[in-house]
Amino acid sequence: QGGTRSPRCDCAGDFHKKIGLFCCRGCPAGHYLKAPCTEPCGNSTCLVCPQDTFLAWENHHNSECARCQACDEQASQVALENCSAVADTRCGCKPGWFVECQVSQCVSSSPFYCQPCLDCGALHRHTRLLCSRRDTDCGTCLPGFYEHGDGCVSCPTSTLGSCPERCAAVCGWRQMF
C-alpha cells in the first residue's frame, strides 16, 4: 500500500499477463474482458459471451466475443453443431449430401457448398465407397444389368431383345428362357 513500483508478472499460476499497470489473470474461454484487473496478480472482470457469440480460447484482451457464423442455406449447408459460448457453429452437409469445396486448395475453413450424393442404386450400380467427404463412388452394374455406354442397361427378358456382346456375357443365362 502507498508504494509506487508496479510488480512484474511473478504471479502464481501461468495465465497472467501485464495489462496496463498490472499483471492480470485472463478470461476463460466463453468469456470476454469487461475490465482488466486493478491490482497486482488480480482477476480481470470477465463476462460470459452473449447469445450467438463465442470465444474459443482463454484470453487477456478480447473486449468482445466473435459472432457465431450462420450456415449458408443457399449452399445447402446445415448446422452439424450449434454455436456455444466456447465454440463456433459447425456447418456441414445433411446426410445424403457431400462437401464440394469452392477453392482448389481446400482447408477446413474454406467456403463450400453441399451437393447431393449420387444414388448408385438408382443408376443400377454397386456402391463402392459411401458418400461422406466426397461423392459416392459407384462400381460395376448390379446383377441383371450390363454396361452400355455410360450406364447400366437391364438385361432383356426375352430373346426378342437385341443382346450385344457385353449383354450376352452378363445376361447370357437369360437366353435360355
Epitope: 508496479s6 491490482e39 472482470t45
Partner: antibody
C-alpha cells in the same frame, strides 16, 4: 454514457485541508481502478494517486505521499481525495480519471487554489 | 521514476500538413504508452493506447508508433480542430508519468 463529475474544489490557506469528490455514472464503477491527476495553471499533467476497484491497493506520487489519501465508496459510485497540509504548489485543476494504465475517461476537473 | 521527454514543446503548421511529435522514455516501457489531446479549458482526451491502438471514434488521421524508448505521434493531414496540446504518457510502471506536452498551432 460514462460520466465523471468532480466537486469540492475551492480556495484554502496553506496548511489547510480539502476533500474532493468524483461522482461516477454510466459504467460499473466497482470494476475499475480510479485515479486523480492534476494540472497546475499553464503547466502539464501530473498523476498523483490510484486506487484499485476494491479499494485494497493505493499508490501515490512522492509529491503528495503522506498528505493526500485516496478512497472510494462503491455503493455510492464515488471516488474521494482527502488533501491535508496543502501547499501553494498544490494549486491546480484536479481531474478524476478511470483506468489502470491509459485513462479512458476524465472528469471536467475542479480547481483547487492554495493561497494566503 | 520514468522520465518522458516530448519534442518539440510547440510547433506551428498549416492545415493539411503532416505533423509529427516524438516522445522518448528514460527506460524501456515496451508499448505501454498513450497519447492525449487537450483543448484549452477542457479535460484531456485519450487518442491512442498501447503506442499504436487508435481509440474508438478517433479520426484515422491520428496514428502512433514505436516501442521500447522511442515513440512517434502523427497527424497525417492537420485539421483546424486539431489545435490543442498533445501529451504522451507511460503506464509501464508507477508512478505514471507524462511528457511535458506539445502545443500545436495553426500557421
Amino acid at each position: 454514457e460514462v460520466q465523471l463529475v468532480e466537486s469540492g474544489g475551492g480556495s484554502v490557506q496553506p496548511g489547510g485541508s480539502l476533500r474532493l469528490s468524483c461522482a461516477a455514472s454510466g459504467f460499473t464503477f466497482s470494476s475499475y481502478g480510479m485515479n486523480w491527476i492534476r494540472q497546475a495553471p499553464g503547466k502539464g499533467l501530473e498523476w498523483i494517486t490510484y486506487i484499485s476497484s476494491s479499494g485494497g491497493h493505493t499508490y501515490y506520487a512522492d509529491s503528495v505521499k503522506g498528505r493526500f489519501t485516496i478512497s472510494r465508496d462503491n455503493a455510492k459510485n464515488s471516488l474521494y481525495l482527502q488533501m491535508n497540509s496543502l501547499r501553494a504548489e498544490d494549486t491546480a485543476v484536479y481531474y478524476c480519471a478511470r483506468g489502470q494504465g491509459p485513462f479512458e475517461y476524465w472528469g471536467q476537473g475542479t480547481l483547487v487554489t492554495v493561497s494566503s | 521514476d520514468i522520465v518522458m521527454t516530448q519534442s518539440p514543446s510547440s510547433l506551428s503548421a498549416s492545415v493539411g500538413d503532416r505533423v509529427t511529435i516524438t516522445c522518448q522514455a528514460s527506460q524501456d516501457i515496451s508499448n505501454y504508452l498513450s497519447w492525449y489531446q487537450q483543448k484549452p479549458g477542457k479535460a484531456p482526451k485519450l487518442l491512442i493506447n498501447d503506442a499504436s491502438n487508435l481509440e474508438t471514434g478517433v479520426p484515422s488521421r491520428f496514428s502512433g508508433s514505436g516501442s521500447g524508448t522511442d515513440f512517434t505521434f502523427t497527424i497525417s493531414s492537420l485539421q483546424p480542430e486539431d489545435i490543442a496540446t498533445y501529451y504522451c504518457q507511460q503506464y509501464d510502471n508507477l508512478p505514471i508519468t507524462f511528457g511535458q506536452g506539445t502545443r500545436l498551432e495553426i500557421k
